[in-house]
Amino acid sequence: DSEEDEEHTIITDTELPPLKLMHSFCAFKADDGPCKAIMKRFFFNIFTRQCEEFIYGGCEGNQNRFESLEECKKMCTRDNANRIIKTTLQQEKPDFCFLEEDPGICRGYITRYFYNNQTKQCERFKYGGCLGNMNNFETLEECKNICEDGPNGFQVDNYGTQLNAVNNSLTPQSTKVPSLFEFHGPSWCLTPADRGLCRANENRFYYNSVIGKCRPFKYSGCGGNENNFTSKQECLRACKKGFIQRISKGGLIKTKRKRKKQRVKIAYEEIFVKNM
């Protein structure tokens, strides 16, 4: 749908020209769809640049979904022969350097840096702690090394690439992409509740991965971590689905999905199993 199309920016292998439009679905997030089946499928993960497994609910979703690992690789990874790995002095910036700064949908705001393609400089912004894009660096130096030009108009540092033997995809070596997900659910769902640094007593919910439930806690109003939700429903939506559960017998169950685009403060966007 149009909302889906609007939401995704094409991000491609570091050393390759942008993907042709026919392959833009490779940049889509893994979308399990609103149904409740448990079907093993594969999607291309733009962050790890690999085809990975995810659980598909059985209806809707998007085109970044393949029956087999081979089919995914065929559609979304490039042949070694088509790759031109340039030397340091010839390198162009990775495509993600040109993406707009993206705070993501969470609200555990932390300082990060992005490359501003207008000013040609790395600049500070506030990242919400989850999702977002790869134009997001923990340090100013890291951002400069990867995205800024050196004095001769060349890259400051070698944006190293390594051919991944498993799936023939290029894996960037220099950048620390925020580790957004681990296991079957978002990694922040595994962190303990963190009150933070201030003195307020706001009612929030966190996901308790030991008992597998969302529990209330008092948030101080600043600091803390991303395992912090304004409602139990939001907490469950983000964390519960990542931990695969058995479903009752019967047909596919459709659930209504709220999609609130782009507003950082309201985290209603669906968080999917595995990487986005």
Epitope: E101, N116, L197
Partner: antibody, heavy 118, light 112 residues
Framework: EVQLVESGGGLVKPGGSLRLSCAAS????????MNWVRQAPGKGLEWVGT????????YYADSVDGRFTISRDNAKNSLYLQMNSLRAEDTAVYYC???????????WGQGTLVTVSS | DVVMTQTPLSLPVTLGQPASISCKSS???????????LNWLQQRPGQSPKRLIY???KLDSGVPDRFTGSGSGTDFTLKISRVEAEDVGVYYC?????????FGQGTKVEIK
């Protein structure tokens, strides 16, 4: 010279709507994140929200979240604040402010007064 | 949200004499990148705010060097070495370390 000029303020009834504009000149508008900050009569300053350089993403203060929407038109060097479901406590002078590379506000406009009263 | 507390709220000063404004934050404004995003604004009567100082002590261009900012962690100070008539107005400290941005209540500087 950096210039930010707000407009669109006025008197509005509680529950009503208003759209503020901020015309930017003297710098490359699309290079900067932008903010709205307000100041109630005789009171201090309160940050309202921020919009990213390309306009795709916004941050909001809890007090206005869900009621106010910030947008921008980089082709027109303009920043906007759509205010819905206005309340008496939204009465303030609204300033637009530019965000520098440190994610700090550096230049401010002259402000436009919004009065919410029945 | 981070609380910014300014003292005094009113500061009557004699022309040519020094002035000092204190700003305290809770919690610390030292960010993960090692920088402290504490800033000072000046708002002259009937005018919009103007940035004076950012990152604790860096003066904005065009700001006279009689203004100095200092401090670290949670305690910050704005000093005017010799107050001039054009310095009358309200001074705000504000922080850009933690989100959302928060401001002090303001200190009104007036001539005795």
């Amino acid at each position: 010279e950096v210039q930010l000029v707000e407009s669109g303020g006025g008197l509005v009834k509680p529950g009503g709507s208003l759209r503020l504009s901020c015309a930017a000149s003297g710098f490359t508008f699309s290079s900067y994140a932008m903010n709205w900050v307000r100041q109630a009569p005789g009171k201090g300053l309160e940050w309202v929200g921020t919009i990213t350089t390309g306009g795709s993403y916004t941050y909001y203060a809890d007090s206005v979240d869900g009621r106010f929407t910030i947008s921008r038109d980089n082709a027109k060097n303009s920043l906007y604040l759509q205010m819905n479901s206005l309340r008496a406590e939204d009465t303030a002078v609204y300033y637009c402010a530019r965000q520098d590379g440190n994610f700090l506000m550096d230049y401010w406009g002259q402000g436009t007064l919004v009065t919410v009263s029945s | 949200d981070v609380v910014m507390t300014q003292t005094p709220l009113s500061l009557p000063v004699t022309l040519g004499q020094p002035a000092s404004i204190s700003c305290k934050s809770s919690p610390s404004l030292l960010d993960v990148d090692g920088k402290t995003y504490l800033n000072w604004l000046q708002q002259r009567p009937g005018q919009s705010p103007k940035r004076l100082i950012y990152l604790v002590s860096k003066l904005d261009s065009g700001v006279p060097d009689r203004f100095t900012g200092s401090g670290s962690g949670t305690d910050f100070t704005l000093k005017i070495s010799r107050v001039e008539a054009e310095d009358v107005g309200v001074y705000y400290c504000w922080q850009g370390t933690h989100f959302p941005f928060t401001f002090g209540q303001g200190t009104k500087v007036e001539i005795k």
